[in-house]
């Protein structure tokens, strides 16, 4: 015997465009309540079939009136848990239906009117006594966030609530092979007859005749230590039984991921990467088909018509994971080429391109010179996303339309004077200098440093720069 507990965290608009209209209005204030229906196993059952594991109805939530013009927020919820008691063993796998109902409080003839706002359903694998499992389900434009767990009612314990506890016979400890009944430390597990020979230290059973091994032990009787690479990279003290160093506590120790899931540590806890066909925080949900709606965030379920054939989720852009459960930082894939800036708008990616580039991914290098004429005999040169003109002598500016002042850049060195000339510029060098730009000093003996002055031109004569 035990209790299934459901905690609703929020009910409100889901992601995506087009927020739903508020279910309540100033004219028709309303309040929400929830109904949960549980059925054993993962069998295909109609919504109308009986809730064989039990059902529960929540209290009514606070009265809510929509603020005119405001989008529908997360709606106010009833207080407390929904509790579904179960009398027999907890089945481990179960189907659920959670319905969100609206109670309209306007001037209804014959009392308040009820209407079903959203219904979500799913199938899950869950061990009793485990931690709260978190879930998100969508119904149309609505999103329901909730947690659930199954816990045993004393004296029952175990993952199926089938093991029983009894008061201790001795004040200090339980009998051989029996453990205290957490959280009732003053009680002991009632003896179960495990498989003959099952190790009392490293094995246990939840059903008569079985032998299940504790972490680190294997074999039919749990007498064989599991040799792992942890001996090579110790994190903790040596184990006397194996001579192997047992790792110290870490979030992935004992691999909390079921069904072959791989565990990776995160700053706060751990994350399981589940093989196809399994999902949930610990990859605990299996036997899933497309009919179970395993693809989140708008994913499309492909294949998986029956539990034996694996399904694949085709995820909308922006989501990944075997069930489209993980949001992708799409800009991390650097989709914008040529130095474009990536913007992830949620529903789409945008690239803001640098000058000279265009296209959805900045993939097109614009022909900078296309349709750009350089005047006065200049030639267009492409480069760096901007065109420039290489101008003919005597012209300048972006398009070579300006008549250049060749002396503007003060090209004559060592105090030489510049004269504009029809074919360029002429430098009149100061005494002691020569060359086209007056760049060479003249030696005192009258001989010049390289190069020699052209014939017929004395040092100090104006040098025309050709």
């Amino acid at each position: 015997a035990g209790v299934f507990e459901l905690q609703i965290h929020s009910f409100g608009p889901g992601p995506g465009p087009g927020a739903p209209r508020s279910p309540c209005s100033a004219r028709l204030p309303c309040r929400l309540f929830f109904r949960v229906c549980l059925k054993p196993g993962l069998s295909e059952e109609a919504a109308e079939s009986p809730c064989a594991l039990g059902a529960a109805l929540s209290a009514r939530g606070p009265v809510y009136t929509e603020q005119p013009g405001a989008p529908a927020p997360d709606l106010p919820l009833p207080d407390g848990l929904l509790q579904v008691p179960f009398r027999d063993a907890w089945p481990g796998t179960f189907s659920f239906i959670i319905e969100t109902w609206r109670e309209e409080l306007g001037d209804q003839i014959g009392g308040p009117a009820w209407s079903l706002l959203a219904r979500v359903a799913g199938r899950r694998r869950l061990a009793a006594g485990g931690p709260w499992a978190r879930d998100i389900q969508r119904a149309g434009a609505w999103e329901l966030r909730f947690s659930y767990r199954a816990r045993c009612e004393p004296p029952a314990v175990g993952t199926a609530c089938t093991r029983l506890c009894r008061p201790r016979s001795a004040p200090s400890r339980c009998g051989p092979g029996l453990r205290p009944c957490a959280p009732l430390e003053d009680e002991c597990e009632a003896p179960l007859v495990c498989r003959a020979g099952c190790s009392p230290e490293h094995g246990f059973c939840e059903q008569p005749g079985e032998c299940r091994c504790l972490e680190g032990w294997t074999g039919p009787l749990c007498t064989v230590p599991v040799s792992t690479s942890s001996c090579l990279s110790p994190r903790g003290p040596s184990s006397a039984t194996t001579g192997c160093l047992v790792p110290g506590p870490g979030p992935c120790d004992g691999n909390p991921c079921a069904n072959g899931g791989s565990c990776s540590e995160t700053p706060r806890s751990f994350e399981c990467t589940c093989p196809r066909g399994f999902y949930g925080l610990r990859c605990e949900v299996s036997g899933v088909t497309c009919a179970d709606g395993p693809c989140f965030n708008g994913g499309l379920c492909v294949g998986g018509a029956d539990p034996d054939s694996a399904y694949i989720c085709h995820c909308p852009p922006g989501f990944q994971g075997s069930n489209c459960e993980k949001r992708v930082d799409r800009c991390s894939l650097q989709p914008c080429r040529n130095g474009g800036l990536c913007l992830d708008l949620g529903h789409a990616l945008r690239c803001r391109c640098r000058a000279g580039f265009a296209g959805p991914r900045c993939e097109h290098d614009l022909d900078d010179c296309a349709g750009r004429a350089c005047a006065n005999g200049g030639t267009c040169v492409e480069g760096g996303g901007a065109h420039r003109c290489s101008c003919a002598l005597g012209f300048g500016g972006r398009d070579c339309r300006e008549r250049a002042d060749p002396c503007a850049a003060r090209p004559c060195a060592h105090g030489g004077r510049c004269y504009a000339h029809f074919s360029g510029l002429v430098c009149a060098c100061a005494p002691g200098y020569m060359g086209a730009r007056c760049e060479f000093p003249v030696h005192p003996d009258g001989a010049s440093a390289l190069p020699a002055a052209p014939p017929g031109l004395r040092p100090g004569d104006p040098q025309r720069y050709l």
Partner: antibody, heavy 118, light 108 residues
Framework: QVQLQESGPGLVKPSETLSLTCTVS????????WSWIRQPPGKGLEWIGY???????NYNPSLKSRVTMSVDTSKNQFSLKLSSVTAADTAVYFC????????????WGQGTMVTFSS | EIVLTQSPGTLSLSPGERATLSCRAS???????LAWYQQKPGQAPRLLIY???SRATGIPDRFSGSGSGTEFTLTISRLEPEDFAVYYC?????????FGQGTRLEIK
């Protein structure tokens, strides 16, 4: 705004292969899934398949053996090839964009009528 | 595959009236992955509703969708002359993507 334009022959001989191209304007083809849907004269809509720029495809099982889709990101185009056509394949062929919040078709081309006749 | 059955096949109403179109799925459509489209003669379909109840961009608020599981409804609260067309439902939760056979909404 985003536009889709189908192009291809209006008349194809039976047993030949139909080739259609959809040119996408004003949005990157790599941001969405893209699909083909057809509609025989006077009848309802039939989904043919979709493609993502990464090469992921999904085809309607009823046509899978005859359908091939491809995408050319450099031209912002995707295409459909339907082999071994018969008169039963006569239809208006639409290309469409799949929305990013689920596989509904939020933008459609205007459609191209393809007749299969010798 | 999920078979979608629309009813009625044809609906004859007058402008200003309320139209209710039904779409029934052969299996539960998870997370309400259902859309509605409007198609006029010679045109491509136009998305009206997605996620069973969310209006697509630019769709007037006289169009509304509801339902979950296997039963879905498109309601046009007050018919305008331009609303007379063929309406299709489509599921996109489970491959292959399928459409209903359509409901023709005609002027009475």
């Amino acid at each position: 705004q985003v536009q889709l334009q189908e192009s291809g022959p209006g008349l194809v001989k039976p047993s030949e292969t139909l080739s259609l191209t959809c040119t996408v304007s004003n949005v990157s083809i790599s941001s969405y899934y893209w699909s083909w849907i057809r509609q025989p004269p006077g009848k309802g809509l039939e989904w043919i398949g979709y493609i993502y720029y990464s090469g992921t495809t999904n085809y309607n099982p009823s046509l899978k053996s005859r359908v091939t889709m491809s995408v050319d990101t450099s031209k912002n185009q995707f295409s459909l090839k339907l082999s071994s056509v018969t008169a039963a394949d006569t239809a208006v062929y639409f290309c469409a964009r799949l929305s990013n919040w689920g596989f509904a078709f939020d933008i459609w081309g205007q459609g191209t009528m393809v007749t299969f006749s010798s | 595959e999920i078979v979608l059955t629309q009813s009625p096949g044809t609906l004859s109403l007058s402008p200003g009236e309320r139209a209710t179109l039904s779409c029934r799925a052969s299996q539960t459509i998870s997370s309400s992955y259902l859309a509605w489209y409007q198609q006029k003669p010679g045109q491509a379909p136009r998305l009206l509703i997605y996620g069973a109840s969310s209006r697509a961009t630019g769709i007037p608020d006289r169009f509304s969708g509801s339902g979950s599981g296997t039963e879905f409804t498109l309601t046009i609260s007050r018919l305008e002359p331009e609303d007379f067309a063929v309406y299709y439902c489509q599921q996109y939760g489970w491959s292959p993507i399928t459409f209903g056979q359509g409901t023709r909404l005609e002027i009475k």
